[in-house]
């Protein structure tokens, strides 16, 4: 572990999504115990949850969280004002929209208030930690006798998202998937009118506004085609 102490106006830079530092200690004590890693996710740029595994502590400890933005106008150290709890022990912090600045380096510091030298600091690139809400309002319409077009909406700027469409018929064992760019539109060129199709979509904050790895939840599925499929064992599992 790197033992550089980060201050709000420090000049350290990193290209990683996070960078962990801990306080050095002179003697073996409770302060040598590593603090849990903080994981932050920004939900649709409406709020952010930064959480840690509170059960990893040897005894129940209300760890405290501070944060700031490195090399920016928002470099003043802030205390968490809205803790999340797990069995009455702090396990996270929720930040509201006005406290989220995507393209500045977010620095989060976890501390044991009973042992102030025991602290860990991470630097995060929030634009790589955005998780959008699931796509909504899926609609299907026929472009021709055998061609279907799937459209959907996102509660976010379209150009910041890419999408993954999955579809299958009631005869298929697995999903077929197709990547779709910010245009949020998918065409299926040949549809079998005798089969029932199911479509679903998820979205990701990538690659134009960030490099997030996490996908949204799947949308509610939408169906198209024959409702009857007597010999098919997959249909009911699909709808469950």
């Amino acid at each position: 572990l790197n033992t550089t102490i980060l201050t709000p106006n420090g000049n350290e830079d990193t290209t990683a999504d996070f960078f962990l530092t801990t306080m050095p200690t002179d003697s073996l004590s409770v302060s040598t115990l590593p603090l849990p890693e903080v994981q932050c996710f920004v939900f649709n740029v409406e709020y952010m949850n930064c959480t840690w595994n509170s059960s990893s502590e040897p005894q129940p400890t209300n760890l405290t969280l501070h944060y700031w933005y490195k090399n920016s106008d928002n470099d003043k150290v802030q205390k968490c004002s809205h803790y999340l709890f797990s069995e009455e022990i702090t396990s996270g912090c929720q930040l509201q929209k006005k406290e989220i600045h995507l393209y500045q380096t977010f620095v989060v510091q976890l501390q044991d208030p009973r042992e102030p030298r025991r602290q860990a600091t991470q630097m995060l690139k929030l634009q790589n930690l955005v998780i959008p809400w699931a796509p909504e309002n899926l609609t299907l319409h026929k472009l021709s006798e055998s061609q279907l077009e799937l459209n959907w909406n996102n509660r976010f700027l379209n150009h910041c998202l890419e999408h993954l469409v999955q579809y299958r018929t009631d005869w298929d064992h697995s999903w077929t998937e197709q990547s779709v760019d910010y245009r949020h539109k998918f065409s299926l060129p040949s549809v079998d009118g005798q089969k029932r199709y199911t479509f679903r979509v998820r979205s990701r904050f990538n690659p134009l506004c960030g490099s997030a790895q996490h996908w949204s939840e799947w949308s509610h599925p939408i169906h198209w085609g024959s409702n009857t499929s007597k010999e098919n064992p997959f249909l009911f599992a699909l709808e469950a």
């Epitope: 634009q127 379209n158 960030g210």
Partner: antibody, heavy 119, light 107 residues
Framework: EVQLVQSGAEVKKPGASVKVSCKAS????????MHWVRQAPGQGLEWMGH????????NYAEKFRSKATLTADTSTSTVYMELSSLRSEDTAVYYC????????????WGQGTTVTVSS | DIQMTQSPSSLSASVGDRVTITCRAS??????LNWYQQKPGKAPKLLIY???RLHSGVPSRFSGSGSGTDFTLTISSLQPEDFATYYC?????????FGQGTKLEIK
Amino acid sequence: EVQLVQSGAEVKKPGASVKVSCKASGYTFTSYWMHWVRQAPGQGLEWMGHIYLGGGATNYAEKFRSKATLTADTSTSTVYMELSSLRSEDTAVYYCARSQPYYYGMDSWGQGTTVTVSS
Amino acid sequence: DIQMTQSPSSLSASVGDRVTITCRASQDISNYLNWYQQKPGKAPKLLIYYKSRLHSGVPSRFSGSGSGTDFTLTISSLQPEDFATYYCHQGHTIPFTFGQGTKLEIK
């Protein structure tokens, strides 16, 4: 201080290519988009495309899709725009301009590079 | 593509006047509307972003309003340095597009 410095004026013959550079300084290069905007003589502003410097993804307006190619060198904080198959209609001032993705405007602009296409 | 239509195309006014320039989008762009000022031979400068947020260093006499498809740039009291061409720009949908510009001249 944020600065975008573009390469100098170019005179090219029809059919040739030109590569315009835009060197950025004074900010974290990879947190931004770099846009390219064209302004023909006496005309308005026309958005050509942009590149996300945090990952290299690009997007173009349809009319520039086969005309312009955007690339970036993060080691030198420089963005390049190459224009191919030049025609007299490509004579214009070309600006690079940075913006944070999402809803921020283009808050810093290069000084502009004049490209003249003439036989 | 989203068309941005500015009006008027040109405008004559005097120092101290209150001036309004409008911009209409061909479809809903929410609040993703920016305004720029450009003087002859110079690069454009950002004035207003996200419909109404004043860019740092821009005088408070500039303000933006509107939403959806109709937007307004207002200069509350014209100063000599405000005579320039103004452009609106939508950042909602790729390809991003500019209005055709409004030239503000001295009366």
